[in-house]
Interface confidence: low
C-alpha cells in the first residue's frame, strides 16, 4: 500500500498554514478526497503530492491515495482538521438523497477534534430530530442516520460547543425516497350505508402517505364536497382525513361518494353507495324454488338471503309440519355482511319424517316477515300384488306406493318365469288411470290398478311392473294350478 | 372507534330514582339497539331491556318492568335508564351496550355503579 | 325464560392446560355468545353465534354446540385469559346470561 507524508491518521493544523500531503509509491498514484479547488498538485511529480499554501475549514476532510497500477494493494487515508474557531463545520454537500433502507450520510465535518464531544443533530427550526431515527456521529463522515426512512426527509443542522458557545453549521437537506414510490393508501367507511330519512349518518374519507404533500378529497357523484380536512401524524405516516357527518340525512344525500386521494406519484379513488329510504326495510328472497324435491336421503341447503336495514334482530327456522314425530334439532347458519343476511338451513339425508314445511322467520323495525319452503320426497315404488274373485271372476290387484306417482304397466308372459319384458310378453295392459287411494301432501302416493283376467290361465305369469323418476319395482303373479295360486316378489324389486 | 361513556357513581337513599346515562360515539346512534344490564356485586350478568334509539321503542325485562324506564336523546346520541323506587336490591353496577344486529352485545359501557343506603 | 346453567363455578387451570367450560340451556336456542369479564372491567364479547370469534381474540378460544349444550374451551391457558366467562343466549327475550365460570391461574 501506498504511504502518506506525514503520516496519519489524522492530522490537525491552523487556519493560513501551507499543507503538504505527499503519497509515496513504486508507481503513479491517484488522491481522492474534497480537492478542488483547495489544493494544488505538486506539478513535478503529477498525482503524487498534495498543496494548499492557506490552508482554511474547507481543507478539512478525509484525503485517500490509490495506486493507478494495482487497486488491489490497496489505499492509504489520512483525516485533516484546519481547526478555525469561527468555523466549527465544513459541509461537504448541502443536500442528500437516499433510497428508503439506506444508511444517510449528513457530511458536516467537525474542523476541530477537540469538538467532537459536544456535538448534536437538530432538524431545522430547533426541532428535535425524530425518536426513531437512529444515528450517530463519526468525526470523519458526519452524522449517520441508519436504515433511513421516508419520514426522516428533513433539513438537518449540526452543533457543537465552541468556548461555551453554540455553533450551528447551515442546513443539509436530506431526501429520503421510497423504494417504489406510490399514490396514498386510501380507506372509505363505511363500505356501503343505508339510513332511513332523517337519521343521521357519517361518512369518513382517509389517506395515508409517507409524505405530506398529498391531497385528499370526498365527492358526491362530481361534486366535490367542501368539508374540513384534518391532519395527523401516526405510526410513521402522515394522515388526512374529511368527515361528511349528517344530522338528519335526506333522499339528495344518496348516491356514489368517491375518496379522492393524490401525490406526485399519482391518484387512488375508493368509491361507496349511501342510500336513503323511507322507512325501515326486510326483505327475504331465495334464488331456490320454494318448493323443493329431493329423493329420501339426499342431502339439501335451503338458502335464505335477507336484505334488512335497520339490523335484524331476531330470527329463526321452523319445521311446520305435518310430521312431528322423529323431529331432530334444526342445523343451520347465519353470514352477516352489511344490511345482508344470508340463512342456511341444513337438512342431512332426509328423513320420510322431515318433509314438509320449513319456515324462516325474520324481524327488525320494519316488522315480522317471512318465507316457506316446502319439501316433498321422491320414493322409489314399492309393489304388492294380491288375487281376489270378484263377482266370479279373477281380478289382480297391484298396490303401488311411491312419489312422484308410479306409472303402471300389466304384462302376461308364457311360462314359470320370473323374467318377462314387453318383447317376450302375450298382452301388456297400461293402466293410465289407476285407482288413488292415498295421495297426502308430502307423503307418498298410493294407487292401485285392477287387471281383470276372468279366469286365471294355468302356467301363466302376470307382471304389474311400475317406474318413476326415481326408480322401478315390480313384482309377479303365477298361477300354479286351478283352485291354486301363488304370489312372488320379482327377485330384484328396486332397480334405481 | 365506538365508545360508551357512562356517568359516574351514585349513592342514594332508599325510595329515591336515579338516572345513569351512557353517551355513545363512533357509531350511528339512531340505527343500533341499546341495552342495559345489571351486575350485583359478585353476581352474574342480568338483562334489563333494550331501546331502539331511532324511534323510543323499548323492550323490558318483566322483572324491571316499573323499576326500570329506558329513554334516548339523538340530539346528544345519549341514553339513558331511570330506576325509581330503590331498595338495597337495585345496588349494582349496571352497563351500557350496543348491538349491531344478530346475537351479540358488540360493546359495552365502562359501568355506572349505584349505591342505595340511607 | 331460558336459564342458563353454567359449569364448572370456579376452576384453576396451569398455563398450556386445555380448558373447558359448559352451558346448558334450559330449554333449545339457536345461538350462544360467550363474554370474558376481568375484575374491575367490563365484560367483553369473546365468542358469538356458538363459535365466531370475537375482533381481537386469540384463535386459541373456540365454542360449539347446539340446542341445549354448548361448550367453550381454550386449547392452551395463558395467565392473561384468567377471567370470569359468561354463556349468553338471545333466542328469546328475556336475554339470559349463565351464572359464570371463574378461570383461575394455578
Known amino acids: 500500500a501506498p504511504v502518506i507524508e506525514p503520516s496519519g491518521p489524522e492530522l490537525v493544523v491552523e487556519p493560513g498554514e501551507t499543507v503538504t500531503l505527499r503519497c509515496v509509491s513504486n508507481g503513479s498514484v491517484e488522491w481522492d478526497g474534497p480537492i478542488s479547488p483547495y489544493w494544488t498538485l505538486d506539478p513535478e511529480s503529477p498525482g503524487s503530492t498534495l498543496t494548499t499554501r492557506n490552508a482554511t475549514f474547507k481543507n478539512t476532510g478525509t484525503y485517500r491515495c490509490t495506486e493507478l497500477e494495482d487497486p488491489m494493494a490497496g489505499s492509504t487515508t489520512i483525516h485533516l482538521y484546519v481547526k478555525d474557531p469561527a468555523h466549527s463545520w465544513n459541509l461537504l454537500a448541502q443536500e442528500v438523497t437516499v433510497v428508503e433502507g439506506q444508511e444517510a450520510v449528513l457530511p458536516c465535518l467537525i474542523t476541530d477534534p477537540a469538538l467532537k464531544d459536544s456535538v448534536s443533530l437538530m432538524r431545522e427550526g430547533g426541532r428535535q430530530v425524530l425518536r426513531k431515527t437512529v444515528y450517530f456521529f463519526s468525526p470523519w463522515r458526519g452524522f449517520i442516520i441508519r436504515k433511513a426512512k421516508v419520514l426522516d426527509s428533513n433539513t438537518y443542522v449540526c452543533k457543537t460547543m465552541v468556548n461555551g458557545r453554540e455553533s450551528t453549521s447551515t442546513g443539509i437537506w436530506l431526501k429520503v425516497n421510497r423504494v417504489h414510490p406510490e399514490p396514498p393508501q386510501i380507506k372509505l367507511e363505511p363500505s356501503k350505508l343505508v339510513r332511513i330519512r332523517g337519521e343521521a349518518a357519517q361518512i369518513v374519507c382517509s389517506a395515508t402517505n409517507a409524505e405530506v404533500g398529498f391531497n385528499v378529497i370526498l365527492k358526491r357523484g362530481d361534486t366535490k364536497l367542501e368539508i374540513p380536512l384534518n391532519s395527523d401524524f401516526q405510526d410513521n405516516y402522515y394522515k388526512k382525513v374529511r368527515a361528511l357527518s349528517l344530522n338528519a340525512v335526506d333522499f339528495q344525500d344518496a348516491g356514489i361518494y368517491s375518496c379522492v386521494a393524490s401525490n406526485d406519484v399519482g391518484t387512488r379513488t375508493a368509491t361507496m353507495n349511501f342510500q336513503v329510504v323511507e322507512s325501515a326495510y326486510l326483505n327475504l328472497t331465495s334464488e331456490q324454488s320454494l318448493l323443493q324435491e329431493v329423493s329420501v336421503g339426499d342431502s339439501l341447503i335451503l338458502t335464505v338471503h335477507a336484505d334488512a336495514y335497520p339490523s335484524i334482530q331476531h330470527y329463526n327456522w321452523t319445521y311446520l309440519g305435518p310430521f312431528f314425530e322423529d323431529q331432530r334439532k334444526l342445523e343451520f347458519i347465519t353470514q352477516r355482511a352489511i344490511y345482508r343476511y344470508t340463512f342456511k338451513l341444513f337438512l342431512n339425508r332426509v328423513k320420510a319424517s322431515e318433509a314438509g314445511q320449513y319456515f324462516l322467520m325474520a324481524q327488525n323495525k320494519a316488522g315480522w316477515n317471512n318465507l316457506t319452503f316446502e319439501l316433498t320426497l321422491r320414493y322409489p315404488p314399492e309393489v304388492s300384488v294380491t288375487w281376489m274373485p270378484v263377482n266370479g271372476s279373477d281380478v289382480l290387484f297391484c298396490d303401488v306406493s311411491g312419489y312422484p306417482q308410479p306409472s303402471v304397466t300389466w304384462m302376461e308372459c308364457r311360462g314359470h318365469t320370473d323374467r318377462c319384458d314387453e318383447a317376450q310378453a302375450l298382452q301388456v295392459w297400461n293402466d293410465t288411470h289407476p285407482e288413488v287411494l292415498s295421495q297426502k301432501p308430502f307423503d307418498k302416493v298410493i294407487i292401485q290398478s285392477q287387471l281383470p283376467i276372468g279366469t286365471l290361465k294355468h302356467n301363466m305369469t302376470y307382471f304389474c311392473k311400475t317406474h318413476n323418476s326415481v326408480g322401478n319395482s315390480s313384482q309377479y303373479f303365477r298361477a300354479v294350478s286351478l283352485g291354486q295360486s301363488k304370489q312372488l316378489p320379482d327377485e330384484s324389486l328396486f332397480t334405481p | 372507534q365506538v365508545q360508551l361513556q357512562q356517568s359516574g357513581a351514585e349513592l342514594v337513599k332508599p325510595g329515591s330514582s336515579v338516572k345513569i346515562s351512557c353517551k355513545a360515539s363512533g357509531y350511528t346512534f339512531t340505527s343500533n339497539f341499546m341495552h342495559w344490564i345489571k351486575q350485583q356485586p359478585g353476581n352474574g350478568l342480568e338483562w334489563i331491556g333494550w331501546i331502539y334509539p331511532g324511534d323510543g321503542d323499548t323492550e323490558y325485562n318483566q322483572k324491571f318492568n316499573g323499576k326500570a324506564t329506558l329513554t334516548a336523546d339523538k340530539s346528544s346520541s345519549t341514553a339513558y335508564m331511570q330506576l325509581s323506587s330503590l331498595t338495597s336490591e337495585d345496588s349494582a353496577v349496571y352497563f351500557c351496550?350496543?348491538?349491531?344486529?344478530?346475537?351479540?352485545?358488540?360493546?359495552w359501557g365502562q359501568g355506572a355503579s349505584v349505591t342505595v343506603s340511607s | 325464560e331460558i336459564v342458563l346453567t353454567q359449569s364448572p363455578t370456579t376452576m384453576a387451570a396451569s398455563p398450556g392446560e386445555k380448558v373447558t367450560i359448559t352451558c346448558r340451556a334450559s330449554s333449545s336456542t339457536n345461538y350462544m355468545s360467550w363474554y370474558q369479564q376481568k375484575s374491575g372491567a367490563s365484560p367483553k364479547p369473546w365468542i358469538y353465534?356458538?363459535?365466531k370469534l370475537a375482533s381481537g381474540v386469540p384463535d386459541r378460544f373456540s365454542g360449539s354446540g347446539s340446542g341445549t349444550s354448548y361448550s367453550f374451551t381454550i386449547s392452551s391457558m395463558e395467565t392473561e385469559d384468567a377471567a370470569t366467562y359468561y354463556c349468553?343466549?338471545?333466542?328469546?327475550?328475556?336475554?339470559?346470561f349463565g351464572s359464570g365460570t371463574k378461570l383461575e391461574i394455578k
Open positions: 351496550a350496543v348491538n349491531y344486529g344478530g346475537y351479540v352485545l358488540d360493546a
Open positions: 353465534e356458538t363459535s
Open positions: 349468553h343466549q338471545w333466542s328469546s327475550t328475556p336475554l339470559t
